[in-house]
């Protein structure tokens, strides 16, 4: 009879050590939750703050209304310019108007001084009809100056404060642009 | 990695139309552009058209007005719709994916614009 109590007695003994395992494990899960959700809440906060933060344009670019744009560093010919843009989902400098073409040179002469820089003008080769990149027409005030008499593809670039034309194959540097990036406030 | 799969290549007479689709899969978060590239034999490999994340559109001046680019971001997928096609555009038309760092290119779909 003593034997059994004694084993019944082992049992509840082994049962208790059971759940105070099950109850530490608990304990521990519980916390690690909470750590996790504190981390959690944590990145959330740090995410939104730098989102709130993140300027409208990338560094070495420059903003003006909702457009950033970028003066490059390297001469290219104006197809590869073009490409040089698109690898950072940008585009050539599309002039919309007077007053961006004013801000453009204006930054340009604080920046660089006097040189070429290639925009995304061409000319249609069957039509002689200047386009921009995406297919608009520039407004009547910003067309390029006769300059060019070349017979191969004719493309548009900015020095000064002039829009002027030019071989789409000599080197000259770029300017590209995309949108900025709007604040959600 | 990002993968590129042309369709809608074929034979066209000039002045005729055709479209072209790209899909895309991968890590399309990398990609800056999506672009429409073209190649005839022993010339080099030359934009067409393109299109950024930011949806801003640039064209070849030889194709300016004729072609139009588009994208279905739900799809991830690019077309390039293809008007008064003439002999000269004759080419393998090549998807790309462009990022600071690299392209991604598809395999090539062949167009051919002949009477």
């Known amino acids: 009879k003593l034997l059994q109590v004694s084993t019944i007695a082992m049992q509840q003994q082994e049962k208790l050590i059971q759940q105070e395992r099950a109850l530490l494990n608990f304990t521990e899960w519980k916390r690690s939750c909470a750590l996790q959700m504190k981390y959690c809440q944590a990145f959330m906060q740090n995410s939104l703050s730098s989102a709130h933060n993140s300027s409208p344009c990338p560094n070495n670019w420059i903003q003006n209304r909702e457009s950033c744009y970028y003066v490059s560093e390297i001469w290219s010919i104006w197809h590869t310019s073009q490409e040089n843009c698109l690898k950072e989902g940008s585009t050539l400098l599309q002039i919309e108007s007077k007053e961006e073409m004013d801000f453009i040179t204006g930054s340009l002469r604080k920046i660089k001084g006097s040189y070429d820089y290639w925009v995304g003008l061409s000319q249609d080769g069957h039509s002689g009809r200047w386009l921009w990149q995406d297919g608009s027409s520039p407004s009547p005030g910003l067309l390029p100056a006769e300059r060019s008499q070349s017979a191969n593809q004719v493309c548009g670039y900015v020095k000064s404060n002039s829009l002027l034309s030019s071989n789409c194959s000599t080197w000259k540097y770029f300017i590209c642009e995309k949108y900025a990036l709007r604040s959600s406030v | 990695q990002v993968q590129l799969q042309e369709s809608g290549g074929g034979l066209v007479q000039p002045g005729g139309f055709l479209s072209l689709s790209c899909a895309a899969s991968?890590?399309?978060?990398?990609?800056?552009?999506m672009a429409w590239y073209r190649q005839v034999p022993g010339k080099q490999r030359e934009l067409v058209a393109a299109i950024t994340s930011g949806g801003r559109l640039a064209y070849a001046p030889s194709v300016n007005g004729r072609f139009t680019i588009s994208r279905d971001y739900a799809k991830n997928t690019i077309h390039l719709q293809m008007n008064s096609l003439e002999p000269e555009d004759t080419a393998v038309y090549y998807c790309?994916?462009?990022?600071?760092?690299?392209?991604?290119w598809g395999q090539g779909t062949q167009v051919t614009v002949s009477s």
């Open positions: 790309a994916a462009l990022n600071s760092a690299t392209t991604y």
């Open positions: 991968g890590s399309m978060h990398s990609v800056n552009s």
